[in-house]
Amino acid sequence: TIQGTNRSSKGRSLIGKVDGTSHVTGKGVTVETVFSVDEFSASVLTGKLTTVFLPIVYTIVFVVGLPSNGMALWVFLFRTKKKHPAVIYMANLALADLLSVIWFPLKIAYHIHGNNWIYGEALCNVLIGFFYGNMYCSILFMTCLSVQRYWVIVNPMGHSRKKANIAIGISLAIWLLILLVTIPLYVVKQTIFIPALNITTCHDVLPEQLLVGDMFNYFLSLAIGVFLFPAFLTASAYVLMIRMLRSSAMDENSEKKRKRAIKLIVTVLAMYLICFTPSNLLLVVHYFLIKSQGQSHVYALYIVALCLSTLNSCIDPFVYYFVSHDFRDHAKNALLCRSVRTVKQMQVSLTSKKHSRKSSSYSSSSTTVKTSY
């Protein structure tokens, strides 16, 4: 969002009346409250970055993210017999992605039509709430998954049912936390009419009267509490995991698991570098600049960073692939247009393969041989 200028003589409270049209005069409208943006922001709002690049990225995210996360959720809920903690966290991750991605057609249409929101205030708030909710949910569930992966290596034996219940409890707590922290995004009016551009923006312009200081404090708090702290936990878990893997015994099976673990670590690292770090950093910098200078010089970068943050919905399926054997099977077969049942029937006679699958449990369980959650 950029800072808009509220031209209302009434001023504006945190949840006040922002814009409205009183009557039409000629070809234009007479607005009761009006917001003005600086020229650079206007050029971004009307330029190819927001009207071409963003819709392309969001279309890719929608086309890839919807089926892959949909399939993942289906696999974790109906095709995975043992609901291990990792499966629970991944199911929640897939659900978070789906809840965000399903609104993307509206987002795509909004940008294609020159950043003009025609779907009403409520839908804009839902879109924004789910957008940020997904990012912070992804960070937290990824952290849980990472810590859990490490914990399995350190403590391979444990009560599965108890662990699953804990994972469910943690997941519910995360959803509740995200619901609470995103309340301001649902409460604050997000749509604003810009008379100079003749468009109604959704979240892209917020008035200066919205108390930019509050927005800065809000995103700074989220960046510290829901990004930096979980990022530190995730990094610690993977550093310790790499150490453990280095010192573990080196048979063929362990080597496979190690490679998969490294792929998982690289995927999560890529997600942090592409999706989470730029967006959280630029959210803070952007609002700091508005708070201190009244305008943001990083607006274009901020827009791109937020756009890239949605790529986590495309990267998450790779995490499922490296962690879940069931998802890996279904993904391979979906890509090869085969049914899992057919493949399993083919495998019945091959006892050696069957045995190897029982013992290769990193993917759905841990990084040590023949251990479960």
Epitope: T5, R7, G11, V29
Partner: antibody
């Protein structure tokens, strides 16, 4: 060069309306906004309203319901009509060019039109 | 509504002297403040925009400074044609003008 030429002085009766014109040259009305500012004798400047190049308008709360700003792109002319005139509306009315964005000032002004409201 | 208070109301100076005009906003307006000069019977003329940017064709003796709530227009050395009324105007939230400062010959 950029110029804003306003219509001549007007004497009006209380309760009537006045329509002041502002002819633009040297730039396109579709790319700029025109703001209207008034100045009562011996007083300061008071902002009244604005019309953007796309036809959207916004008026100061004080004048809402009494002022109407329009523009005719074909003649490059902006108009400001003030109705229900009172003696306190006696002032010099100025039109000013504005780029329409937050970081722009009113860079060019018309010469002003004196409107006298007297019975 | 943001209120702009200009001080002093009148400034009596001689040509060649330095003039310092002040404009204080009732709330933070960042750098969104412009300065105008108005001579009797004439329209206002833009001098400074966005607190410190010099408008086209304005002599370098005019300079602006400040941000937030306090702003200053400085005329380094007064020329005879500089004696006029100066207005500040904010465009952060609405468009409002200050009451003006009259710079007169001492």
């Amino acid at each position: 060069q950029v110029q804003l030429v306003q219509s001549g002085a007007e004497v009006k009766k209380p309760g009537s309306s006045v329509k002041v014109s502002c002819k633009a040259s040297g730039f396109s009305l579709s790319s700029y906004a025109i703001s209207w500012v008034r100045q009562a004798p011996g007083q300061g400047l008071e902002w009244m309203g604005v019309i953007w190049g796309n036809g959207n308008t916004y008026y100061a709360q004080k004048f809402q319901g009494r002022v109407t700003i329009t523009a005719d792109e074909s003649t490059s002319t902006a108009y400001m009509e003030l109705s229900s005139l009172r003696s306190e509306d006696t002032a010099v009315y100025y039109c000013a060019r504005w780029r329409g964005f937050k970081d722009y000032p009113f860079d060019y002004w018309g010469q002003g039109t004196l409107v006298t409201v007297s019975s | 509504e943001i209120v702009l208070t200009q001080s002093p109301a009148t400034l009596s100076l001689s040509p060649g002297e330095r003039a310092t005009l002040s404009c204080r906003a009732s709330q933070n307006i960042y750098k969104w403040l412009d300065w105008y000069q108005q001579k009797p019977g004439q329209a206002p003329r833009l001098l400074i925009y966005n607190a410190y940017s010099l408008a086209t064709g304005i002599p370098a003796r005019f300079s602006g400074s400040g941000s937030g709530r306090d702003f200053t227009l400085t005329i380094s050395s007064l020329e005879p044609e500089d004696f006029a009324v100066y207005y500040c105007q904010q465009h952060n939230s609405g468009w409002t003008f200050g009451g003006g400062t009259k710079v007169e010959i001492k």
